[in-house]
Amino acid sequence: MAVTACQGLGFVVSLIGIAGIIAATCMDQWSTQDLYNNPVTAVFNYQGLWRSCVRESSGFTECRGYFTLLGLPAMLQAVRALMIVGIVLGAIGLLVSIFALKCIRIGSMEDSAKANMTLTSGIMFIVSGLCAIAGVSVFANMLVTNFWMSTANMYTGMGGMVQTVQTRYTFGAALFVGWVAGGLTLIGGVMMCIACRGLAPEETNYKAVSYHASGHSVAYKPGGFKASTGFGSNTKNKKIYDGGARTEDEVQSYPSKHDYV
């Protein structure tokens, strides 16, 4: 039950995270005009990964796409790439994790297959979240660098052009959305990986060796218990302490994909 809950929660958290990454990537407010220490302006500028916008006090908003590819800064291209990779990995992860969900039955898919899929999707979510966090952080770093450069230009008078006020940009809402979304996707991925451990316990099966003792007979089977994470009860775990003496064949466990002997 706990495995299903962890897996389900991981899926939901990742879903919210990836939706947030998509939203952040599409948002126009990656950088917004810094109004601190500026005259009160009737025109407000903000920029996204794909276009820049101008909002006037009248309510009129005009956005222009970056119709050039080669003319854009390499850092912006890198941020775009990171966000897109994050979205693609996240989307594939979501698709895989849907089929991996314990509560969904698809044909005669075994738990081991679901475990592998859960792990795969978990890793994809982790990488997706890291891509988003990296992308947003690179952009934030770029903003900070440009902010202080333009501040220096403002005070040195832009080479004598004291009348020109340098437009400085600060963190936009999309950055915070991206950081949170990336974090959620990362957490969701970790939860999926934890759930995987519960779904696919490590098991090493050996041929059982019977030790016949006088009185009560105990069949001792090394590695008989599956290594459990504690998430839910494992129906495949079998009691190997039994009152009666057994033959080797009787003690042998049911075959599974994890029987490597």
């Epitope: 005009q33 005259p39 009160v40 302006t41 009737a42 025109v43 500028n45 903000y46 920029q47 820049s52 916008c53 101008v54 006037e56 006090s57 009248s58 309510g59 009129f60 005009e62 222009r64 009348q163 020109t164 006020v165 437009t167």
Partner: antibody
Framework: QVQLVESGGGVVQPGRSLRLSCTVS????????VYWVRQAPGKGLEWVAV???????NYNSALKGRFTISKDNSKSTLYLQMNSLRAEDTAVYYC????????????WGQGTLVTVSS | DIVMTQSPDSLAVSLGERATINCKSS????????????LAWYQQKPGQPPKLLIY???TRESGVPDRFTGSGSGTDFTLTISSLQAEDVAVYYC?????????FGQGTKVEIK
């Protein structure tokens, strides 16, 4: 067609208050911003205040908070509440509509004269 | 506040001749986001309210004769009347539309020589 009609002007004593009205037709106050601009006799134009379509307002800081702009969308009326009036507030007060894009005043009323005198 | 300075204060031009009015702002009115200049030109005839001629420094308002041309960028702007007509006798104002308060120039009076 677009029309703006100012009213409420007149002679008022220094220190007193006056409320000007501007009734608009041909457009709605929820779609356009409207300004108050004044012109002292024989002088140039002075921007007073604006109320935007969304209800946000901006003022000329030189007026030191004595003037308040407001609007009643349902009545299509713009107001300018003027308190602690001084002789230098004597002017023709115009209301003008913002054109929407690139922030310019495309339609003006005929103005109402406010005279502050004892 | 942004200071708008017009020159000359008055201008006498013969009919059919070119009239040029300059306007200088204390700060750039060019917005980097859309590369637009937030400056407007108005014409005011005696006893009348002002009339919008040019907005965005160079865009002519609908119904305004094409002899009126606005140019310039940043801090320096010009209104040109290519061929002065009798009905163009008026006071012309430039206005900052970028920063609050939206200040006007002191005005330039255009007369016929």
């Amino acid at each position: 067609q677009v029309q703006l009609v100012e009213s409420g002007g007149g002679v008022v004593q220094p220190g007193r208050s006056l409320r000007l009205s501007c009734t608009v037709s041909g457009f709605t106050l929820t779609s356009y911003g409207v300004y108050w601009v004044r012109q002292a006799p024989g002088k140039g134009l002075e921007w007073v205040a604006v109320v935007w379509a969304g209800g946000n307002t901006n003022y000329n800081s030189a007026l030191k908070g004595r003037f308040t702009i407001s609007k009643d969308n349902s009545k299509s009326t713009l107001y300018l509440q003027m308190n602690s009036l001084r002789a230098e507030d004597t002017a023709v007060y115009y209301c003008a509509r913002d054109r929407g894009r690139l922030l310019a005043m495309d339609y003006w009323g005929q103005g109402t004269l406010v005279t502050v005198s004892s | 506040d942004i200071v708008m300075t017009q020159s000359p204060d008055s201008l006498a031009v013969s009919l059919g001749e070119r009239a040029t009015i300059n306007c200088k702002s204390s700060q750039s009115l060019l917005n980097s986001g859309n590369q637009k200049n937030y400056l407007a030109w108005y014409q005011q005839k005696p006893g009348q309210p002002p009339k919008l001629l040019i907005y965005g420094a160079s865009t002519r308002e609908s119904g305004v004769p094409d002899r009126f041309t606005g140019s310039g960028s940043g801090t320096d702007f010009t209104l040109t009347i290519s061929s002065l007509q009798a009905e163009d006798v008026a006071v012309y104002y430039c206005q900052n539309d970028h920063f609050f308060p939206f200040t006007f120039g002191q005005g330039t009076k255009v007369e016929i020589k």
